[in-house]
Interface confidence: low
């Protein structure tokens, strides 16, 4: 996952990223504070800097890193590291270093250039971020227009592994392993013990050999209005065993089937080099959701979910030391408690409270891929602080044996926080800045016939800014 030519491959998908179009001696400038500029070139030296230097301070021409073309792929981010800059004034033996992270942004923003996010005074490292379409894997459209409406297949994308399909024509009844793994609109995700080729979206698993690629995403869905079918074509670069002049291809035909099941692909027929799958699913049926008070009607499912039995009281949920009050179609806390005005979900804290979304903003939806009713609240209180490079502060954190619930100035010249729960152990920190986001919450209701009312559990918390609850209850079970 590291190349030396301003290119890098995503090892799990085989996608090649190429940033060479950003290279050039003229380079770019990144402003720091209101004070000055850093000159920077991508994958090469900058004409405003000393020879061999990829980035330098504009005012002094002090090098903040030597140029190189070694692009790395790290957790869906492309990274270019310029090391061995000028000696860092604050630390003997350390040299300036620059870390440039390229982050996917499908459409180029108004300022298509690097931004200096932070300067770590301890390590003499400058952190830059560049949001650019060049860091995106080629996103294939996963929808198709049908008259005035759009049919979106993206709820069927498998986010973790792949769908399993079987070849019913094979005689061996003792073999219960899937014969195919399938994903749509994007490659299969890595699966433990199933080494499908990187980038494959349709993968055949022979009994006697390694999995083979029989289809990669070839384009967006296609509508056949006469047959009222939607097709997805897949092409591979794997030569067909029966005829080496051809490569394997696959096709999935989607048909409307209303109901609460999303369906799965099934092998319909196969010739020597082609595989045709059928997928019956409500996703391709004309759809509409209607919200009426605390009731959601989904036209694909032909069913109404009524949550009003959950709105008669609020529910308190505790995760670690944090307690949330959760309301369904009702305020999370009464007016006498205060501190969480208008909130549908509230983080309780003494007499104060933080709203994780206003009741007035409530939306109900049905998420087909999860077979779940989702209630969401938005526009709550402002999110807690984060560091200058966008890493969430972790509260509380331990520093010098004491616990802190907020950014502190102690022993540094500016407000800072730890980015882990124990600074004394990890020494990971950053300077604090305001968040420009507002708190939101979601409640994912899942069917569980054994739970009458049930109760919410904290499913995830993101940056103290977004909380998701999972709530298992028979209230959302279809008949």
């Amino acid at each position: 996952n590291e190349h030396d030519d301003c290119q890098v491959t995503n090892p799990s998908t085989g996608h090649l990223f190429d940033l060479s179009s950003l290279s050039g001696r003229a380079g770019f400038t990144a402003a720091y504070s209101e004070k000055g500029l850093v000159y920077m070139s991508i994958c090469g030296e900058n004409e405003n800097c000393p020879p061999g230097v990829g980035a330098c301070f504009g005012q002094t021409r002090i090098s903040v890193g030597k140029a190189n073309k070694r692009l790395r792929y790290v957790d869906q981010v492309l990274q270019l590291v310029y090391k061995d800059g000028s000696p860092c004034p604050s630390k003997s033996g350390l040299s300036y270093k620059s870390v440039i992270s390229f982050v996917c942004r499908p459409e180029a923003g108004p300022t298509n250039r690097p931004m200096l996010i932070s300067l770590d005074k301890q390590t003499c490292t400058l952190f830059f971020s560049w949001h650019t379409p060049l860091a995106c894997e080629q996103a294939t459209e996963c929808s198709v227009r049908n008259g005035s409406s759009i049919v979106d297949l993206s709820p069927l994308i498998h986010r973790t592994g792949g769908y399993e399909a079987y070849d019913e024509s094979e005689d061996d009844a003792s073999d219960t392993n899937p014969d195919f793994y399938i994903n749509i609109c994007q490659p299969l995700n890595p699966m433990h013990g199933v080494p499908c080729p990187a980038g494959a979206a349709v993968c055949k698993v022979p009994i006697d050999g390694p999995p083979i690629d029989i289809g990669r995403v070839a384009g967006p869905p296609i509508l056949n209005p006469i047959a009222n079918e939607i097709y997805l074509n897949f092409e591979s670069s794997t030569p067909c065993l029966a005829d080496k002049h051809f490569n394997y291809t696959s096709l999935i035909a989607f048909h409307c089937k209303r109901g609460v099941s999303m369906g799965t692909p099934k092998l319909l027929r196969t010739s020597e080099c082609d595989f045709v799958f059928e997928w019956e699913t409500p996703v391709v049926c004309p759809d509409e959701v209607r919200m009426d008070g605390c009731t959601l009607t989904d036209e694909q499912l032909l069913y109404s979910f009524n949550l009003s039995s959950l709105s008669t009281s609020t529910f308190k949920v505790t995760r670690d030391s944090r307690t949330y009050s959760v309301g369904v179609c009702t305020f999370a806390v009464g007016p006498e408690q205060g501190g969480c005005k208008d909130g549908g979900v509230c983080l309780l804290s003494g007499t104060k409270g933080a709203s994780f979304g206003r009741l007035q903003s409530m939306k109900l939806d049905y998420r087909h891929q999860d077979e779940a009713v989702v209630l969401s609240y938005v526009n709550g209180d402002r999110c807690p602080p984060e560091t200058d490079d966008g890493v969430p502060c972790v509260f509380p954190f331990i520093f010098n044996g004491k616990s802190y619930e907020e950014c502190i100035i102690e022993s540094r010249a500016k407000l800072w926080c730890s980015t882990t729960a124990d600074y004394d152990r990890d020494h990971e920190w950053g300077f604090c800045r305001h968040s420009n986001s507002y708190r939101t919450s979601s409640i994912i209701f899942k069917c569980d016939e054994d739970e009458d009312i049930g109760r919410p559990q904290v499913f995830s918390e993101v940056r103290g800014c977004d909380v998701t609850f999972e709530w298992k209850t028979k209230v959302v079970c279809p008949p």
Partner: antibody, heavy 119, light 107 residues
């Protein structure tokens, strides 16, 4: 134009109290830490106190600890210094200053307000 | 608290002279030092931050250098408007502290 304007200075007796204000304009006040710095007549500069951008953290010079309180109202773009138990040695011109968020130091200063502690 | 010692306390110079003021910290403050200029009955004005970086709008005849404990402010060619008092200040650790000042007077 970035501007800081102090007010509230005056003559006060030893042991008395005074509240200084600093009105900010021309920048996003709520994003910056703010400082008070003072200068006794004919003397050098002395840092007095700092408050974080959101008011959650405050630090004081030893000479004023327990007597002075720094605060802010971000909705009014105003910084305050409440001075209690004033002493003759608190006589000075008091400046408010903006903290340079990125590199530290104080990059914008007010014109100052004079506090005289005298019986 | 970190002590900041400036030298000289005062100096006399003529227009066009090269002037150097030094500042010493009682302990390592890396490069977290600022220089300010103050004229009589006026507020201080920030000249240099991070030991060597010039504030916007400050003439290039001013420069700063140093790291650790020893720092220098240099005015390469003194102008009439530069006669003032100059202060160094550390912001490595609270409480922030200033040097006692250097008064630059006309010879």
């Amino acid at each position: 134009e970035v501007q800081l304007v102090e007010s509230g200075g005056g003559v006060v007796q030893p042991g008395g109290s005074l509240r200084l204000s600093c009105a900010a304009s021309g920048f996003t006040f709520s994003s910056y830490a703010m400082h008070w710095v003072r200068q006794a007549p004919g003397k050098g500069l002395e840092w007095v106190a700092v408050i974080s951008y959101d008011g959650s953290n405050k630090y004081y010079a030893d000479s004023v600890k327990g007597r002075f309180t720094i605060s802010r109202d971000n909705s009014k773009n105003t910084l305050y210094l409440q001075m209690n138990s004033l002493r003759a040695e608190d006589t000075a011109v008091y400046y408010c200053a903006r903290d340079d968020r990125f590199f530290g130091g104080m990059d914008v200063w007010g014109q100052g307000t004079t506090v005289t502690v005298s019986s | 608290a970190i002590r900041m010692t400036q030298s000289p306390s005062s100096l006399s110079a003529s227009v066009g002279d090269r002037v150097t003021i030094t500042c010493r910290a009682s302990q390592d403050i890396s490069s977290w030092l600022a220089w300010y200029q103050q004229k009589p009955d006026k507020a201080p004005k920030s000249l240099i931050y991070a030991a060597s970086s010039l504030e916007d709008g400050v003439p290039s005849r001013f420069s700063g250098s140093g790291s650790g404990t020893d720092f220098t402010l240099t005015i390469s060619s003194l102008q009439a408007e530069d006669f003032a008092t100059y202060y160094c200040q550390q912001y490595n650790t609270y409480p922030w502290t200033f040097g006692q000042g250097t008064k630059v007077e006309i010879k």
